[in-house]
């Protein structure tokens, strides 16, 4: 009598994650009597995948009716494949007994699973930084197979070169992850800038996946301060202006001090945006010159985005303002711009 053959015709099968995989197996003879079982892997640690007689295998179905008389086709279909299903599958014939005895195994079919990378997620620095400083952005994508993948970084369409990328794990795995860090030098014009992480993989139909981050989340543009005096009004009041320009984000508190004493505090809100994404704000203070005998030291103090205050001081010369209308004397600016780059 001819020896029983267990035929697995495909050495390897490749499927996309989420699809079904068909693993073919036929036997050359109906004898000896005994069941067929499917295993993943070989040796003592092998995993039972399908056993017609017993067990619950919700994702595995026989391709043909195994209860049919003279059935010699023991192919199976595994639904909703994931990268974790990758491996070599063996169709094994047993001889009926107590217990059943393994008789012959097929040559095995290697199941390879191709899986798309997840949408890249880009995260920026935890705290804002100012122009000329370097900040790091991180991009992560997971769950892809095979391991080969390309990742590129762009800032406003220009590819970045200060990049470090790792694909894990280094060895063979059912799926892989990529993590990349890009270092970006900020400029004052970067409020509207964007960084893009672009991931290309064999499973993607030509178009890379993209993750983005706005530099507006990472940048702080400190304000410029300028204090000026308008000409004296008829009622002996001097209008002093504090112009706070080119700052970002909008979170800003301005305090006027007269001779060191708090006169008024204001919070910036609902400001119109400049073309470059920064904001300007102007605050006025009316000083009644006739109420002062000596010169008045006015200080415009700005706290921007939780940073140490920036001061600009200005002296209104009372002696330069006779108690009648008409003087147009420009006040002397005795203050210095104490704004730091931090």
């Amino acid at each position: 009598e001819e020896e029983l053959q267990v035929i697995q015709p495909e050495k390897s099968v490749s499927v996309a994650a989420g699809d079904s995989a068909t693993l073919n197996c036929t036997v050359s003879s109906l004898i000896p009597v005994g069941p067929i079982q499917w295993f993943r892997g070989a040796g003592p640690g092998r995993e039972l995948i399908y056993n017609l007689k017993e067990g619950h295998f919700p994702r595995v179905t026989p391709v043909s009716d195994p209860t049919k008389r003279n059935n010699m086709d023991f192919s199976i279909r595994i639904s909703n494949i994931t990268p974790a299903d990758a491996g070599t599958y063996y169709c094994v014939k047993f001889r009926k007994g107590s217990p059943d005895v393994e008789l012959k195994s097929g040559a095995g079919t290697e199941l390879s699973v191709r899986a798309k990378p997840s949408a890249p997620v880009v995260s920026g620095p935890a705290v804002r930084a100012t122009a000329e400083h370097t900040v790091s952005f991180t991009c992560e994508s997971h769950g892809f197979s095979p391991r080969d993948i390309t990742l590129k970084w762009f800032k406003n369409g220009n590819e970045l070169s200060d990049v470090q990328t790792n694909v894990d794990p280094a060895g063979k795995s059912v799926s892989y992850s990529i993590r990349s860090t890009a270092r970006v030098v900020l400029t004052r014009r970067d409020v509207h800038s964007q960084v893009i992480c672009e991931v290309a993989h064999v499973t993607l139909q030509g178009d890379p996946l993209r993750g983005t981050a706005n530099l507006s989340e990472a940048i702080r543009v400190p304000p410029f301060l300028e204090v000026t005096q308008q000409s004296m009004r008829a009622d002996n009041q001097v209008n002093v202006t504090c112009q706070v320009t080119k700052f970002y984000p909008q979170r800003l508190q301005l305090t006027w001090l007269e001779n060191g004493n708090v006169s008024r505090t204001e919070m910036a809100s609902a400001l119109p945006e400049n073309k470059d994404g920064t904001y300007n704000w102007t605050s006025w203070l009316l000083v009644n010159v006739s109420a002062h005998r000596d010169d008045v030291k006015l200080t415009c103090q700005v706290e921007h985005d939780g940073q140490p205050a920036v001061n600009k001081s200005f002296s209104v010369k009372v002696s330069a303002h006779p108690k009648e209308q008409g003087s147009n004397t420009a006040a002397e600016n005795t203050g210095t711009n104490e704004r730091n780059i931090y």
Epitope: V15, D148, A200, D207
Partner: antibody, heavy 116, light 109 residues
Framework: VQLVESGGRLVQPGTPLTLSCTVS????????MGWFRQAPGKGLEYIGI?????SPYYASWVNGRFTISKTSTTMDLKMNSPTTEDTATYFC?????????????WGPGTLVTVSS | DIQMTQSPSSLSASVGDRVTITCRAS??????LAWYQQKPGKAPKLLIY???FLYSGVPSRFSGSGSGTDFTLTISSLQPEDFATYYC???????????FGQGTKVEIK
């Protein structure tokens, strides 16, 4: 699933010509499509692909000689200024469902002859 | 660009023969290699993808192997309908470009 090329004919050098690839049985918005050519008695040559979203990518030698575009059911290859060296059978093909590294469905081809 | 060198450029064989065609890439393409069969006046037909995976409907006498730079297409027992030209095609995952070998013509001895 079927691909059919059309538009191939005898054309004079320098006269632009557009070839079309009409698809049926699947959506062009789901697959990368490619154009290839084969000069008489020669091997296969890759021209370019168009991604599922409509972005074209070209072989390095193309240098603006061809333009690939698509509508919902057709993919076009415009030969901007053909020369006699562009005489060939032009094939369109679709990448496999598992990835963009192979082409599993091909059209029968359309012959372009560039001659004065 | 990657160059694909296919050998031999032609071979003569008889029905039943075992035929081996090789393809070498100028740099590593991992397993991104496909094999096609083309008959005169016809479009190419996919046989093997990812270096070793048999495309559905292709007879099991065709097999592929290799990775990196060296690849092989084997026809275990040549049949009359197998006389044709065979091409290898690479895909490079970094440049995302395709290159074909120059072809191997399998003729009747």
């Amino acid at each position: 699933v079927q691909l059919v090329e059309s538009g191939g004919r005898l054309v004079q050098p320098g006269t632009p010509l557009t070839l079309s690839c009409t698809v049926s049985g699947f959506s062009l918005s789901s697959y990368v499509m490619g154009w290839f050519r084969q000069a008489p008695g020669k091997g296969l040559e890759y021209i370019g692909i168009i991604s599922s979203s409509g972005s074209p990518y070209y072989a390095s030698w193309v240098n603006g000689r061809f333009t690939i575009s698509k509508t919902s059911t057709t993919m076009d290859l415009k030969m901007n200024s053909p020369t006699t060296e562009d005489t060939a059978t032009y094939f369109c093909a679709r990448v496999g469902p598992l990835g963009v590294d192979y082409f599993n469905i091909w059209g029968p081809g359309t012959l372009v002859t560039v001659s004065s | 660009d990657i160059q694909m060198t296919q050998s031999p450029s032609s071979l003569s064989a008889s029905v039943g023969d075992r035929v081996t065609i090789t393809c070498r890439a100028s740099q590593s393409i991992n397993s991104y290699l496909a094999w096609y069969q083309q008959k005169p006046g016809k479009a190419p037909k996919l046989l093997i993808y990812s270096a070793s995976f048999l495309y559905s409907g292709v007879p099991s006498r065709f097999s592929g192997s290799g990775s990196g730079t060296d690849f092989t297409l084997t026809i275990s027992s040549l049949q009359p309908e197998d006389f044709a030209t065979y091409y290898c095609q690479s895909w490079h995952y970094i440049s995302r470009s395709y290159t074909f070998g120059q072809g191997t013509k399998v003729e009747i001895k």
